[in-house]
């Protein structure tokens, strides 16, 4: 009978190995190792047995020894088993970014490594063990999914094997593929709200805010704002899982009409978008024409209204009859019209939104000179030595100059107050004189004497 | 002056309808005009309006379901295809008016008509 | 649009009390704000419009006030006929999509 010693071994790919082989006889007729691995015999040996050293062992092995002894031939195996960690040990790429609330499938591929029966493919979040399995095939995949948080943003994910030798080898071997960093992120089925107004003049500024809630993460998402062709440059402020976009707009002639409003809020690979109808008006202020804007008391006046051709105008308050862009009445020029205002105001609807505008203009009318009794009395009866102030108005546009003189040369003190003295007292030429000429009127001031008893 | 609707009627699901509102006293080219209805236990609802020209918009809500035209005197809401949901009264109001004070001219349902039933049942 | 927002939902005031509505609208409509009052079976009546003028024939118990975006309406010496549901409407646009009346206010009279 032959004996093998060790009956089995376990050795590193590459690695040595000595085995003895021994007859059951004392003086075996012959003693040897069959095997196609590299083998030195270790001399001396013994009558009955031989040791060799077999070197460079690259796979699993079974050396054989065999022994012819009188009583028969026989033989013996040695189980050499080779062990080598994975040459590859790697994680599958992740997807750029990954929703939250939706499966993520891990998968890591193990290329090598023996004795696959000892090796375990563990898939990691961090330190924490996801699925342990057995490594099958060459090369080996091992998958798992896993559902996905807003916790697993920025965490860390690998694949580790385990090569487990023990009791035989009692070290545990590890190999750990690079870590790949898993980007999550969360756009909620809702569309972005947009405030914005609904019309718009030409020239003039609006704003426009878009925002939207539950992010994640808010600071990843990218805004897009737009009016037609136009890119619009928001403000963008972050709450906590909330952002807010806000613009302001300046729309031209050549943009009026009906625009697109877009809203794009853009995280991971998803986008949410809204689009609003956004009407762009051009409304000038009505024109209020006067055929003159002065004019002499008497004079036919023509007051015109006119706006933009979709408006409806109200002249002072009366409206267009029919109601229209275009209002005008005919008024005789009086005293009383001279600095009056005419408005003209005009109202226009865009895409059902009002819009108002307005114009004033001023008519100015030319009248007098003018000196009334009302206002400049022909006759005035004072006690002598009372305290009196001479009144005498005159009227007129432009405003008239007024002197009153007695004898061509003594000054009636109009609006001041005077003494009444025996000097005051006779007739008055008063004279009011402007562009437009002069109208004169007789004063005349009548002084009473005290009674002394 | 006065509007007033017609056309109200027990209709089956699906087969459109078309009520008319009748103004009398004043011009329709002069003023814009708004159906409004009020569905059983529920609040005035706008439905549309259409404009001294001719123009329409419509609530959100009424968009495609209904249409709103004019003629001369009168003016026209058909209900495209109606459900059940579409059983109301059924209003028609002038809507326009002025402030002398401001020269402005504004929406305001100044004049109404009685009312239409409408009534969409299997 | 112009959202309106019409508080309270419903309201029970005695005879002879003093019931207080209010209308929000969501953006300014300076003073184009008519108040409706509308009882089952008859067309809505106009109440006040221009947010304050009094509209011909109604009762000076009724007051409206505001402008911009907060509008009230006030009810002052309540009798037994104005039990009825009130409406708030925005008089500034009719634009696509446009909410043009408040929710409604019902007034219950004890």
């Known amino acids: 009978q032959t004996s093998v010693f060790p009956p089995e071994v376990i050795l590193p790919r590459g690695g040595s190995v000595k085995v003895n082989c021994s007859a059951s006889c004392d003086q075996p007729i012959s003693l040897g190792m069959e095997t196609p691995l590299p083998k030195k015999e270790i001399l001396p040996g013994g009558n009955n047995w031989k040791m060799y050293e077999l070197s460079n062992v690259q796979e699993d092995s079974q050396p054989m020894c065999y022994s012819n002894c009188p009583d028969g031939q026989s033989s013996a195996k040695t189980l050499l088993t080779v062990y080598w960690t994975p040459e590859r040990v790697e994680l599958a790429p992740l997807p750029p970014w990954q929703p939250v609330g939706k499966n993520l499938t891990l998968r890591c591929q193990v290329e090598g490594g023996a004795p696959r029966a000892n090796l375990t493919v563990m898939l990691l979040r961090g330190e924490k063990e996801l699925s342990r399995q057995s490594a099958v095939g060459e090369p080996a995949e091992v998958t798992t999914t896993v559902p996905v948080g807003r916790d697993d943003h920025g965490a860390n994910f690998s694949c580790r094997t385990e090569l487990d030798l023990r009791p035989y080898v009692l070290k545990l071997f590890e190999n750990t593929s690079a870590p790949h960093q898993l980007q999550t992120f969360d756009l909620p089925a809702t569309p972005p709200q947009l405030v914005s107004p609904q019309v718009l003049e030409v020239d003039t500024q609006g704003t426009v805010v878009c925002s939207l809630d539950g992010l994640f993460p808010v600071s990843e998402a990218q805004v897009s704002l737009a009016l037609g062709d136009q890119k619009l440059n928001p403000t963008i402020t972050y709450g906590n899982n909330s952002l807010s976009a806000k613009a302001s707009v300046k729309v031209t002639a050549e943009e009026e009409g009906t625009q697109q409003l877009l809203c794009g809020v853009m995280l991971g690979n998803q986008t949410q978008e809204t689009r609003q109808t956004v009407t762009i008006y051009s409304f000038p202020a009505p024109n209020v024409n006067l055929t003159k804007p002065e004019v002499s008391e008497g004079t036919e006046v023509i007051v015109e209204c006119e706006a933009h051709p979709r408006a409806k105008v109200m002249l002072n308050g009366v409206p267009a009859q029919p109601p229209g862009p275009r209002a005008q009445f005919l008024l005789k020029a009086t005293p009383e019209d001279n600095g009056r205002s005419f408005s003209c105001s005009a109202t226009l609807e865009v895409a059902g939104q009002l819009v108002h505008k307005n114009q004033t203009r001023e008519l100015r009318v030319l009248y007098g000179p003018r000196l009334d009794e009302k206002d400049c009395p022909g006759n005035w009866t004072w006690p002598e030595n009372s305290q009196q102030t001479p009144m005498c108005q005159a009227w007129g546009n432009p405003l008239p100059q007024l002197k009153c003189l007695k004898d061509g040369t003594f000054p009636l003190p109009i609006g001041q107050s005077v003494t009444v003295t025996r000097d005051l007292e006779g007739t008055y030429l008063c004279q009011a004189r402007s562009t437009r000429g002069e109208v004169t009127r007789e004063v005349t001031v009548n002084v009473l004497s005290p009674r002394y008893e | 002056q006065s509007v007033e609707e017609s056309g109200g009627r027990l209709v089956t699901p699906g087969t459109p309808l078309t009520l008319t509102c009748t103004a009398s006293?004043?011009?329709?080219?002069?003023?814009?005009m708004s159906w409004v209805r009020q569905a059983p236990g529920k609040g005035l609802e706008w439905i549309g309006i259409i404009s001294d020209s001719g123009t329409t918009y419509y609530a959100s809500w009424a968009k495609g379901r209904f249409t709103i035209s004019k003629t001369s005197t009168t003016v026209d809401l058909k209900i495209t295809s109606p459900t059940t949901e579409d059983t109301a009264t059924y209003f028609c109001?002038?809507?326009?008016?002025?402030?002398?004070?401001?020269?402005?001219?504004?929406?305001?349902?100044?004049?109404w008509g009685p009312g239409t039933l409408v009534t969409v049942s299997a | 649009g112009y959202d309106m927002t019409q508080t309270p939902a419903s309201v029970e005031v005695a005879v002879g009390g003093t019931v207080t509505i209010k209308c929000q609208a969501s953006?300014?409509?300076?003073?184009?704000l008519v108040w409706f009052q509308h009882k089952p079976g008859q067309p809505p009546k106009r109440l006040i419009y221009?947010?304050?003028t009094l509209a011909s024939g109604v009762s000076s118990r009724f007051k409206g006030s505001g402008s911009g975006t907060h509008f009230t309406l006030t009810i002052s010496g309540v009798e037994s006929a104005d039990a009825a549901t009130y409406y708030c409407?925005?008089?500034?646009?009719?634009?696509?999509?446009?909410?043009?009346f408040g929710g409604g206010t019902e007034v219950v009279v004890k």
């Open positions: 409407q925005q008089g500034y646009s009719r634009s696509d999509g446009e909410h043009v």
């Open positions: 006293g004043f011009s329709l080219s002069n003023y814009y």
């Open positions: 221009k947010a304050s």
């Open positions: 953006q300014s409509i300076n003073s184009w």
């Open positions: 109001a002038r809507d326009w008016s002025y402030d002398s004070s401001s020269g402005y001219y504004y929406y305001d349902m100044d004049l």
